[in-house]
């Protein structure tokens, strides 16, 4: 997956730091106070859909074969720049019952982006 | 994740059968001859982004909190209807060296869709 460098507008991973205070979650998330969540941004022209080598690649490559052949409804189905590899992170937080929990929360950090 | 029923245009899973002959892969995939790959389709209005209970939920909920607060660049970042749960499938195929391989291929079947 590409890292965004400002030079291309193709689907890439953009660095982004989330502050839990900014979104009002600091009253239930004890630690950390924030983290590098990152996000995905950019164009997904038809020739790169399903070519990210991502977890979606088999499925999206299959769909893209239909799309490229103008098969309805895939011809109009827009390929999207989305997280294709996410990583967990450990958090200390109050759960629904106000008990303190330390847990690895899945899919918190975007590691790679690709075209769906 | 919703199943598409023709009544709603909200992000949902659409049934779709892939024929390997249709996409010209029948010369290297021995079995099966095709499979129910399914795909994701539909709108992702802001109020359902990150509320799917999907594998993307923590990250997309975080981003949605910024989006709803009009935080640049998320205000313009479109939430996308994408696979959030994929399932493997066993395949019999010829590898690059024309050896016959039987393998579980990851992420072949879309089980659930959600808004990124």
């Amino acid at each position: 997956g590409l890292e965004c460098d400002g030079k291309v507008n193709i689907c890439c991973k953009k660095q982004f730091f989330v502050s839990f205070k900014d979104i009002g979650w600091n009253d239930w998330i004890i630690a950390p106070s924030g983290y590098h969540a990152n996000y995905c941004e950019g164009e997904c022209p038809s020739h790169i859909a399903g070519t990210s080598g991502s977890s979606l690649s088999f499925h999206s490559t299959v769909i893209n074969h239909y799309r490229m052949r103008g098969h309805s409804p895939f011809a109009n189905l827009k390929s999207c720049c989305v997280p294709t590899k996410l990583r967990p992170m450990s958090m200390l937080y109050y759960d629904d019952g106000q008990n303190i929990i330390k847990k690895d929360i899945q899919n918190m950090i975007v590691e790679e982006c690709g075209c769906s | 994740g919703l199943e598409c029923d023709g009544k709603v245009n909200i992000c949902c899973k659409k049934q779709f059968f892939v024929s390997f002959k249709d996409i010209g892969w029948n010369d290297w995939i021995i079995a099966p001859s095709g499979y129910h790959a399914n795909y994701c389709e539909g709108e992702c209005p802001s109020h359902i982004a990150g509320t799917s209970g999907s594998s993307l939920s923590f990250h997309s909920t975080v981003i949605n909190h910024y989006r709803m607060r009009g935080h640049s660049p998320f205000a313009n970042l479109k939430s996308c209807c994408v696979p959030t749960k994929l399932r493997p499938m066993s395949m019999l195929y010829y590898d690059d060296g024309q050896n016959i391989i039987k393998k579980d291929i990851q992420n072949m079947i879309v089980e659930e869709c959600g808004c990124s």
Partner: antibody, heavy 124, light 107 residues
């Protein structure tokens, strides 16, 4: 500490309207889903409505749909329930309740903090 | 809509008794269920969340179990302050729905 204080209840004639308010303090109001739950005299609890943390999504119980409207003003940390076309069966204590607008592993957060309630009496 | 059928509607017991209250959901709700205690003239207070987890600050004599459609609240040894009304709530899908309530009375 976390506090929810309801107001706006009273005695009202059938067919009339009221606006219930709930003032929130001690937490980041704009990050929580908010609900109204009511309880008729001597009866059980009935869920009435919910509004998402950002006001983008609302659900109402069938019994109040079209007559009651939930809303919020995050800048004032206040939740509202506009109650129109009141009926005798709407007589109840109305509670304002908080829930975290988040889910994880298909667990959806429930009702955790309740106000003390405001009483609405519909009588001619 | 999901119906929550709570039973019994009332029960008589003595201090020290073990009591069980049941809630049955008309369709599967995973573990999206809470148990609430309500004393006369007061707001409800949650005892159990996620079907089986004890709310912080609640005595350990209260416990919950179940998943899917069948749920129970158990009070292992009734104390004088436990003689009041209990409700279950499903928060799996809207509209959220409460059970009819169980009044625990002194025998």
């Amino acid at each position: 500490q976390v506090q929810l204080v309801e107001s706006g209840g009273g005695v009202v004639q059938p067919g009339r309207s009221l606006r219930l308010s709930c003032a929130a303090s001690g937490f980041t109001f704009s990050s929580y889903g908010m609900h109204w739950v009511r309880q008729a005299p001597g009866k059980g609890l009935e869920w009435v409505a919910v509004i998402w943390y950002d006001g983008s999504n609302k659900y109402h119980a069938d019994s109040v749909k079209g007559r009651f409207t939930i809303s919020r003003d995050n800048s004032k940390n206040t939740l509202y329930l506009q109650v129109n076309s009141l009926r005798a069966e709407d007589t109840a204590v109305y509670y304002c309740v908080r829930s975290r607008n988040w889910n994880y592993d298909n667990y959806y957060y429930g009702l955790d903090v309740w106000g003390q309630g405001t009483t609405v009496t519909v009588s001619s | 809509d999901i119906q929550m059928t709570q039973s019994p509607s009332s029960l008589s017991a003595s201090v020290g008794d073990r009591v069980t209250i049941t809630c049955r959901a008309s369709q599967g709700i995973r573990n999206n269920l809470g148990w609430y205690q309500q004393k006369p003239g007061k707001a409800p207070k949650r005892l159990i969340y996620a079907a089986s987890s004890l709310q912080s600050g609640v005595p350990s004599r209260f416990s919950g179990s179940g998943s899917g459609t069948e749920f129970t609240l158990t009070i292992s040894s009734l104390q004088p302050e436990d003689f009041t009304t209990y409700y279950c709530l499903q928060h799996n899908s809207y509209p959220w729905t409460f059970g009819q309530g169980t009044k625990v009375e002194i025998k």
